[in-house]
Amino acid sequence: KAMHVAQPAVVLANSRGTASFVCEYASPGKATEVRVTVLRQADSQVTEVCAATYMMGNELTFLDDSICTGTSSGNQVNLTIQGLRAMDTGLYICKVELMYPPPYYMGIGNGTQIYVIDPEPCPDSD
């Protein structure tokens, strides 16, 4: 079953290479188990950046080596991606799956274009 997912069109990463955005899914009821996946689309290639399955009301838990962190409130997931560099600029798509209870619902956002600008190296100081 299809589900509406909203996310901002554009986000600019900060000077430390961190970008945050909200992914909101519109469900007709309250799920108990939700899976959120961030996908990156660049040059028609889609790769998985990170994913987390969480129980409603609990924290999102990404893998220890994940570049993503997140929190949830209701049907809103606040996602943060760290360690980004200019070459990581691209379209980051939020995919939400309601895993339990059945039936299974899935929605994919239109994507958030994240722009990353590498900081200028500091000039040598005498």
Partner: antibody
Framework: DVQLQESGPGLVTPSQSLSLTCSVT?????????WNWIRQFPGNKLEWMGY???????NYNPFLKNRISITRDTSENQFFLKLNSVTTEDTATYYC????????????WGQGTSVTVSS | DIVLTQSPSSLSASLGGKVTITCKTS??????MAWYQHKPGKGPRLLIY???ILQPGIPSRFSGSGSGTDYSFSINNLEPEDIATYYC????????FGGGTMLEIK
């Protein structure tokens, strides 16, 4: 398309039990969703009574918890409402409906069955 | 229990006009709000869920908005078949309904 149909006696005597059946077609009640009973009092107020989930678990309105029971017959794809010790205050139109999740919007409803509690 | 205060309880409007119904909740419901249309002899019909999402098959004349404790529902370009009673429902904690708004056409 999913269809729900309520049935049961239109008249119940005070202090007796009210028993209603909801017959579901177009979807198996064990495949998913929660299967609810809602009633509408003569003044138009709607009250959620409780549900039985796809897995057989129940959730009831705390105001009715001591009097209500919702069960099912999976072979007939039906679920049932039993309300004990009825009074004239239980006179209402009773609806069955379906929702997703623990709590949710009801996407399919029956057309309702009117029940009068009177001696 | 979360209490829903729906207003007005009745309203009259002209064909082609616009009406707005509001629903105030006793606590933040995280946008878990649905709206129904109810006609005599039928079960309620789901129009909108999660505050603003139209149920498939529902005309875009119907719309919803809100957050926190304040929600609204509008019908644009009123048509004769819109004569009905409209209900709000929250599904953040239990399922509870507003008192209803009876809509008539002038």
């Amino acid at each position: 398309d999913v269809q729900l149909q309520e049935s049961g006696p239109g008249l119940v005597t005070p202090s007796q039990s009210l028993s209603l059946t909801c017959s579901v077609t177009g979807y198996s009640i064990t495949s998913g969703y929660s299967w609810n009973w809602i009633r509408q009092f003569p003044g138009n107020k709607l009250e959620w009574m409780g549900y039985i989930r796809f897995d057989g678990n129940n959730n009831y309105n705390p105001f009715l918890k001591n009097r209500i029971s919702i069960t099912r017959d999976t072979s007939e794809n039906q679920f049932f409402l039993k309300l004990n010790s009825v009074t004239t205050e239980d006179t209402a139109t009773y609806y069955c409906a379906r929702n997703y999740g623990t709590w949710g919007a009801m996407d399919f409803w029956g057309q309702g069955t009117s029940v009068t509690v009177s001696s | 229990d979360i209490v829903l205060t729906q207003s007005p309880s009745s309203l009259s409007a002209s064909l082609g006009g616009k009406v707005t119904i509001t629903c105030k909740t006793s606590q933040d419901i995280n946008k878990y709000m649905a709206w129904y249309q109810h006609k005599p002899g039928k079960g309620p019909r789901l129009l909108i869920y999660y505050t603003s999402i139209l149920q498939p098959g529902i005309p875009s004349r119907f719309s919803g908005s809100g957050s926190g404790t304040d929600y609204s529902f509008s019908i644009n370009n009123l048509e004769p078949e819109d004569i009905a009673t409209y209900y709000c429902q929250q599904y953040d904690n239990l399922n509870t309904f507003g008192g209803g708004t009876m809509l008539e056409i002038k």
